[in-house]
Amino acid sequence: GSERTCCPVNWVEHERSCYWFSRSGKAWADADNYCRLEDAHLVVVTSWEEQKFVQHHIGPVNTWMGLHDQNGPWKWVDGTDYETGFKNWRPEQPDDWYGHGLGGGEDCAHFTDDGRWNDDVCQRPYRWVCETELDKASQEPPLL
């Protein structure tokens, strides 16, 4: 694969990663695909410091991250271990709420207006954040 040594235009560098903040909305899966088309992934939050950085850039707006439990357990899109990793859920979240009337529960995680996390219906058109690591050879995932 190829190595990225500096961030693309319109991306923000922070702690050896590049971040791109959308200004419009997509469903979680479409946002995920968008990041893949950018050779990136939905943001994976691994520390309080990274949480504060992302929160600062997105402001008080619902924003998708790369965390979901569509196949059962919660998983980060880049394979980062969820159980042992950083978490910042709102109180009593995630709750897989079924009361929204849209069918099913809530399988995708997003930053809320105060930065803490909530699980929500994956089809909601929220903003999103893409992330790609610098100095890391790009992988060749399977065809979609």
């Epitope: 694969g1 190829s2 693309p8 235009v9 319109n10 419009s24 909305g25 997509k26 469903a27 899966a29 479409d30 695909n33 968008y34 893949r36 088309l37 950018e38 050779d39 058109p125 790009s138 992988q139 060749e140 995932p141 065809l143 979609l144």
Partner: antibody
């Protein structure tokens, strides 16, 4: 000047193969996702495939999945479409196009002139 | 898949006329919509992106509007070079899909 030049079209038999190429110039090729779009004779436009800048991620229309493969060689500034198991309904003009408008994937801003693929026995 | 339905399929108009073409998405695509112009034997040309943003070097007589599921392309005063076929494209979700096209013909 940004330019895209397709080649490789021609006549193929049903079940046969062709490889289309698209030579890019005038921009940093590896920084942009690319796509193929086709147009059957007298018909509308149909999106076929897209590929990320590194080539690491690809997306395909259901109509070509398992038969067509999009790829790129950034050292040669060239985009490819490998077309296998060709069918009569694949007959079309094939366009390559550059993705990215205002740093967003709102669509294709630069197109090649197209190359014609005819599938017939 | 998201279906894009354009109307009308063709329209006859005269130079100076105001022409409006609509595109309806089968589900919400916010503003992930572009409009293209295509002339016979030529590649499509981008006119509008993000539903309402005018591509550079495109004449200001072209404008786009809409969000969600209903979108409009308007040519405020048709010029001889505007007789062509127009397509909408959604890039909200894969597979990306085009409308079936609207042919603008000389009356």
């Amino acid at each position: 000047e940004v330019q895209l030049l397709e080649s490789g079209g021609g006549l193929a038999q049903p079940g046969g193969s062709l490889r289309l190429s698209c030579a890019a110039s005038g921009f940093t090729f590896s920084s942009y996702a690319m796509t193929w779009v086709r147009q059957a004779p007298g018909k509308g436009l149909e999106w076929v495939s897209a590929i990320s800048g590194s080539g690491g991620n690809t997306f395909n229309a259901d109509s070509v999945k398992g038969r067509f493969t999009i790829s790129r060689d950034n050292s040669k500034n060239t985009l490819y479409l490998q077309m296998n198991s060709l069918r009569a309904e694949d007959t079309a003009v094939y366009y390559c196009a550059k993705l990215g408008i205002d740093y967003y994937y709102y669509g294709m801003d630069v197109w090649g002139q197209g190359t014609t693929v005819t599938v017939s026995s | 898949d998201i279906q894009m339905t354009q109307s009308p399929s063709s329209v006859s108009a005269s130079v100076g006329d105001r022409v409006t073409i609509t595109c309806r998405a089968s589900q919400d695509i916010t503003t992930w919509l572009a409009w293209y112009q295509q002339k016979p034997g030529k590649a499509p040309k981008l006119l509008i992106y993000d539903a309402s943003s005018l591509q550079s070097a495109v004449p200001s007589r072209f404008s786009g509007s809409g969000s969600g599921t209903d979108f409009t392309l308007t040519v405020s005063s048709l010029q001889p070079e505007d007789f062509a076929t127009y397509y909408c494209l959604q890039t909200n979700s894969f597979p990306w899909t085009f409308g079936q096209g609207t042919k603008v013909e000389i009356k």
